[in-house]
């Protein structure tokens, strides 16, 4: 890899527009962005916003409630890694303003991409400890009335975040600051070196571990879940299902552009007009993605409203009420007295 | 079919200038970038410059820093290089060659396709 | 300003023969900056290898490249009549961008 530095004395003689002034970090590919560009720019501002402050009040709702429930636990962890993920939308808005300029230093190029990528594992892993969860209370009613505490919550959870650092290293080391001189800027990019095998293979297990197991484990937990709630006639199997349906739907459409595109891209030559076309696609699909970091606290909300007719509650007791109900431990009963809170299903599916 | 076509080949007297064209076609002219090279005869290639067709920035191999000039024409897709003040050193065959700048990743100045090639020759 | 210095500069080969190429820069390039040319003779050039070890597109498989930092080589497997140019490899990670003194391919 490039060693990076700042100066460049062997072209200080390159006066004018050829010289490598990254003060003035300006790419004038064309006086505008490009539309893909634009339309990232506008949702992770949206992101930002509600992902910021409706991750906040999640935390804030579910940490007072962190010791004595075990759903609060679950919901805590994944506005954790949203509300994480949702820090670095400020530097790489301002990075697609400046044409992908990359002003802030090689760590921050390291850390701050990577962050989307660890919420995509973070979240997967804990989406599927909390389906391990609805399992066992629907199966397992009795194994749960013993053994089911806020300290292996927390356990579950810590190994899902230690599980989601290690995934996310690839990303992190592959990461690297680079002077282009023409246009003269920094960038913030990936770099296999000129291995190939590589670059795919890092993709496939991105694709496999971060999608289409996850989505193949859940569907198969889900279906078994909802079978035995209908079988028992539960009272709100209806809503179950509506909640279990935007949790993968919401997995599905959010990352499905992010995880085709790359795997795509590690297999098509550069110069193809495919890849050329993706490429350009590239800050949209991430932004897209970006959309799971603010989506559970809208479900909570539009969840809380439609399960309970809360419209009149103020917000933190509607999320209260929502991410804080514990499950009752009664065969399918535990289930669908606590219906709501399969929301934690859709959580990690982000 | 990508294409980079080259005006045919130049005489010219010494001291006098020459404008050397290159038609883009095949492809979107404004995605890819342009390199000038030039091929003295039985020598080496050299890089001479790139444009970006996008608004006409360009930079310079030192080496020929008023020498040559490059210039875009979008609406014809087609890349110009004006040399000047022309001697027999100037006698060799140029190239046009595109690459593609990516806006968000690094670029490797890779040269994917090639003009046809035009040959000046310098001669009293 | 890097410089490339390709050996040999001349060389004839049968068909059938492997055939090994390399190209020496006088300071590290990152290996994804280091590309391949062939220019058969009255032709333009045409890429050949990108980024090391890349083939372009419809580029035969008997032709590979490979190395690092200041050493570079492109192997062509086994020799054949079409192969028959000059070959330049080229850095694309520094202005001014340089090519290589060229190595010209004959058939023996």
């Known amino acids: 890899m490039d060693s990076f530095n700042y100066t460049t004395p062997d072209y200080g003689h390159y006066d004018d527009k050829d010289t490598l002034d990254l003060n003035t970090p300006v790419d004038k590919t064309s006086n505008t962005l490009r539309v893909p560009d634009i339309l990232a720019l506008v949702i992770f501002a949206v992101v930002f916003l509600v992902g910021v402050l409706g991750n906040a009040l999640v935390v804030w709702v579910t940490a007072f409630e962190a010791k004595r429930t075990i759903n609060a636990i679950w919901f805590l962890n994944l506005a954790v890694a949203d509300f994480l993920s949702c820090l670095a939308l400020p530097i790489l808005f301002t990075s697609i303003v400046q044409h992908h300029h990359w002003p802030f230093g090689g760590a921050a190029c390291s850390i701050l991409p990577s962050l989307i990528l660890l919420n995509m594992y973070a979240s997967i892993l804990l989406l599927a400890t909390i389906s391990a969860d609805r399992f066992l209370l629907v199966f397992k009613p009795i194994w749960c009335q013993n053994f089911r505490g806020a300290g292996l919550a927390w356990i579950a959870c810590a190994v899902a975040w230690g599980l989601a650092l290690l995934l996310t290293i690839p990303s992190f080391l592959y990461r690297v600051v680079r002077e282009e001189y023409f246009p003269p800027k920094v960038l913030c990019g990936v770099d296999y070196s000129h291995d190939k095998r590589r670059e795919r293979a890092v993709a496939i297990v991105r694709l496999v571990l971060g999608f289409l197991w996850p989505l193949l484990t859940l569907t198969i937990c889900y279906t078994f879940i909802l079978l035995r709630t209908w079988s028992r006639r539960a009272t709100r199997s209806t809503k179950t299902l509506k909640v279990v349906v935007a949790v993968v739907a919401s997995f599905f459409i959010f990352w499905l552009p992010y995880q085709v595109t790359g795997i795509m891209m590690s297999f098509l030559e550069p110069s193809s007009p495919t890849f050329l076309l993706l490429k350009k696609l590239d800050s949209l699909c991430v932004s897209f993605a970006y959309i799971n970091c603010c989506i559970n606290p809208i479900i909570y909300v539009v969840a809380g409203q439609g399960f309970q007719g809360r419209l009149r509650k103020s917000l933190p007791s509607l999320l209260r009420n929502v991410l804080t109900e514990e499950s009752v431990v009664r065969e399918s009963k535990s289930f669908t007295r606590s219906t709501v809170d399969t929301m934690a299903q859709k959580t990690q599916a982000v | 079919e990508v294409q980079l076509q080259q005006s045919g080949p130049e005489l010219v007297k010494p001291g006098a200038s020459v404008k050397i064209s290159c038609k883009a076609s095949?492809?979107?002219?404004?995605?890819?970038?342009m390199s000038w090279m030039k091929q003295s005869h039985g020598k080496s290639l050299e890089w001479i410059g790139d444009?970006?067709?996008?608004?006409?920035?360009?930079i310079y191999n030192q080496k020929f820093k008023g020498k040559a000039t490059l210039t875009v024409d979008r609406s014809s897709s087609t890349a110009y290089m004006d040399l000047r003040s022309l001697t027999s050193e100037d006698s060799a065959v140029y190239y046009c060659?595109?690459?593609?700048?990516?806006?968000?990743?690094?670029?490797?100045?890779?040269?994917?396709?090639w003009g046809t090639g035009t040959t000046v020759t310098v001669s009293s | 300003e890097i410089v490339l210095t390709q050996s040999p500069t001349t060389m004839a080969a049968s068909p059938g023969e492997k055939i090994t190429i390399t190209c020496s820069a006088t300071?590290?390039?990152?290996?994804?900056?280091l590309h391949w040319y062939q220019q058969k003779p009255g032709f333009s050039p045409k890429l050949l290898i990108y980024?090391?070890?890349n083939l372009a597109s419809g580029v035969p498989a008997r032709f590979s490249g490979s190395g690092s930092g200041t050493s570079y080589s492109l192997t062509i497997g086994t020799m054949e009549a079409e192969d028959v140019a000059t070959y330049y490899c080229?850095?694309?990670?520094?202005?001014?961008?340089?090519f290589g003194s060229g190595t010209k391919l004959e058939i023996k």
């Open positions: 080229q850095q694309g990670r520094t202005i001014p961008r340089t």
């Open positions: 060659a595109r690459w593609y700048y990516y806006v968000s990743s690094f670029s490797y100045w890779y040269f994917d396709v």
């Open positions: 095949g492809y979107t002219f404004t995605d890819y970038y």
């Open positions: 300071s590290s390039i990152n290996s994804n900056y």
């Open positions: 444009i970006n067709p996008n608004n006409g920035d360009n």
């Open positions: 980024r090391t070890s």
